[in-house]
């Protein structure tokens, strides 16, 4: 094939090599950019900055090499449009630093930075950590800081992410109240801070106030939906990012719902209870306290992480006629109590038979599957015992 005279020439089916001395000062308008998976750049002394707009449209890029060039600055968001980037070689450039934000969100298998005049500071604490943890092939590079010695020896005692303290009200919060949260941010080189309120939706009216180092947040006219929702304060400095999440407990009275008993492998009287604080529960059977045993007990379903309502069953393992009756669920918390009742009829008396009647005990030879923690059983083809009305 004839030599390629352009600044950048195709390499393989989805690669591009740009090696002609001084031909590039930016990466705008590279040919076939949207399909590129590999980009190799060398000897580009005028290529000094790498910014967000430079890599727009390179969504398929996996490998990026910029070596022996004049790169001095890589923007923190430079690789926002290249989420699939896995190998990044920026060796032998003029980089003094590289922000932790630059590689955040990427799954880099390889990061090469050797041959750069790195300046040891807290801004490179993340890179030192990569070296300590053996990430991205960094340890093998034995990175040096210009005139300061090995990166591994950089003192880091003062290199911490911001420290956050979120103050929440001590007192009970009721529906309709206004709640003031304050986030105190401490640390060196604070850059940005804010609140993440994505979970709140219609739980309150939100008003932000203040700025670093003390951020305020007013949640006005709160609803019970605010319970279990995260309110997150975040802050960043040159070392990294810190987040602290809190939840505001909004008190509201107990409520309860009962549903008709359903037969599964066992019987279940389904219920839902709500309230903050979580209500205590008590079952009554025909008006008397029901003692829970391995045959009759409360079983909760896995709770949803972001809501207070709990669903469950009063589980009955093979109940008989003595379990027929009125079931009441009482729920109570300091703000109120509630109850619901339901009649359940599981079976007529299976133990009384006409002496002349045969007792049907035929068994199927086929195993039935068990998913419930009950024994895998071989079960009757016909119901066990025909109920007979006794005069």
């Amino acid at each position: 094939a004839a030599p390629c005279p352009d600044a950048c020439c195709p390499h393989g089916s989805s690669g591009l090599r740009c090696t002609r001395d001084g031909a590039l000062d930016s990466l705008h308008h590279l040919p076939g950019a949207e399909n590129l998976t590999e980009l190799y750049i060398e000897n580009q002394q005028h290529l000094q900055h790498l910014e967000l707009r430079d890599l727009r449209g390179l969504g398929e890029l996996r490998n990026l090499t910029i070596v022996k060039s004049g790169l001095r600055f890589v923007a923190p968001d430079a690789f926002h449009f290249t989420p699939r980037l896995s190998r990044l070689n920026l060796s032998f450039n003029a980089l003094e630093s590289l922000s932790w934000k630059t590689v955040q969100g990427l799954s880099l298998q390889e990061l090469v930075l050797s041959g750069n005049p790195l300046h040891c500071s807290c801004a490179l604490r993340w890179l030192q950590r990569w070296e300590e943890e053996g990430l991205g092939g960094v340890p093998e590079q034995k990175l040096q800081c210009h005139g300061q010695g090995p990166l591994a020896h950089m003192p880091n005692a003062s290199c911490g992410v911001p420290t956050l303290k979120v103050q929440v009200p001590n007192a009970s919060v009721d529906v309709g109240d206004d709640v003031l949260l304050r986030c105190q941010v401490e640390g060196r080189g604070l850059e940005q801070a804010g609140w993440i309120l994505t979970e709140l939706e219609q739980s309150a009216t939100v008003m932000k106030s203040g700025g670093l180092p003390s951020l305020g947040l007013t949640l006005a006219n709160v609803t019970s939906d605010l319970n279990r929702k995260n309110v997150t304060c975040w802050a960043e400095n040159d070392v990294g990012r810190a987040e602290v999440s809190v939840q505001v407990n909004v008190s509201f009275p107990a409520s309860v719902q009962l549903h008709t008993a359903v037969e599964m492998h066992h019987w279940c009287i389904p219920f839902s209870v709500d309230g903050q604080p979580a209500p205590s529960l008590r079952w009554l059977f025909n008006g008397s306290v029901l003692n829970e045993t391995s045959f009759i007990f409360t079983e909760f379903l896995e709770p949803a992480a972001n809501e207070t309502v709990r669903h469950g069953c009063l589980r009955l393992n093979q109940p008989t006629h003595v379990n027929n009756g009125n079931y009441t669920l009482l729920a109570a918390n300091p703000f109120g109590q509630a109850s619901a009742s339901i009649m359940a009829a599981f079976m007529d008396n299976p133990f009384e038979f006409n002496p002349e009647d045969p007792i049907p005990v035929s068994f199927s030879p086929v195993d039935t599957n068990s998913t419930s923690g009950d024994p895998v059983e071989k079960k009757d083809e016909t119901p066990f015992g025909v109920s007979v009305a006794v005069g």
Epitope: E292, T293, F295, T298, N317, H321, F351, G373, D374, P375
Partner: antibody, heavy 115, light 108 residues
Framework: EVQLQESGPGLVKPSGTLSLTCAVS?????????WTWVRQPPGKGLEWIGE???????NYNPSLKSRVTISVDKSKNQFSLKLSSVTAADTAVYYC????????WGQGTLVTVSS | SSELTQDPAVSVALGQTVRITCQGA??????ASWYQQKPGQAPVLVIY???NRPSGIPDRFSGSSSGNTASLTITGAQAEDEADYYC???????????FGGGTKLTVL
């Protein structure tokens, strides 16, 4: 397949406390099952001691209630039996099992009460 | 009273049918379960609840109940069925479990 394994001292002094642990493997102690202890004196029948649910509910044999404590350790996936003020009459093979049907049992451990 | 009564011993000729019974007031209210125990071994569940048989238990074992009596029937007894058999159930209050005294089955 759920498996249960009892462990604890094989010899306890009279008036002392018998302590046994049952390790559950092949399933979670926090499942929808209760866990129980049963004992069998040499040459005699089975006696139910008590049962526990992972949420803390317990029921004990009325004849032993004043001396028995059953507890559960969810983090270790095990449950335990303590029987205080033991006498020679408490010498038995002690079994743990899954309630309510006792469909899985440990192999049993003989505890002798003797000075 | 909160107790279950079993015959101490029962025998059966090889291949014949045998019925082991368990009596108690609570059996008018609750199902019985049955356990087989061979010397030096832990008991094994053979019938539970409403006449259910766990996986792996031969279909010659069956359960029935009438009035205050629960029965375990072995249809065509085998030599390996020689063992102690225990019934259990809830007591009359429903709050505790009780065992019968056991029946020693001999297969002749």
């Amino acid at each position: 397949e759920v498996q249960l394994q009892e462990s604890g001292p094989g010899l306890v002094k009279p008036s002392g406390t018998l302590s046994l642990t049952c390790a559950v493997s092949g399933g979670s102690i926090s499942s929808s099952n209760w866990w129980t202890w049963v004992r069998q004196p040499p040459g005699k029948g089975l006696e139910w001691i008590g049962e526990i649910y992972h949420r803390g509910n317990r029921n004990y044999n009325p004849s032993l209630k004043s001396r028995v404590t059953i507890s559960v350790d969810k983090s270790k996936n095990q449950f335990s039996l303590k029987l205080s003020s033991v006498t020679a009459a408490d010498t038995a093979v002690y079994y743990c099992a899954r309630a309510p049907w006792f469909d899985y049992w440990g192999q049993g451990t003989l505890v002798t009460v003797s000075s | 009273s909160s107790e279950l009564t079993q015959d101490p011993a029962v025998s059966v000729a090889l291949g014949q049918t045998v019925r082991i019974t368990c009596q108690g007031a609570s059996l008018r209210s609750y199902y019985a379960s049955w356990y087989q125990q061979k010397p030096g071994q832990a008991p094994v569940l053979v019938i539970y609840g409403k006449g259910n048989r766990p996986s792996g238990i031969p279909d010659r074992f069956s359960g029935s109940s009438s009035g205050n009596t629960a029965s375990l029937t072995i249809t065509g007894a085998q030599a390996e069925d020689e063992a102690d058999y225990y019934c259990n159930s809830q007591d009359s209050s429903g709050n505790h479990l009780i065992f019968g005294g056991g029946t020693k089955l001999t297969v002749l």
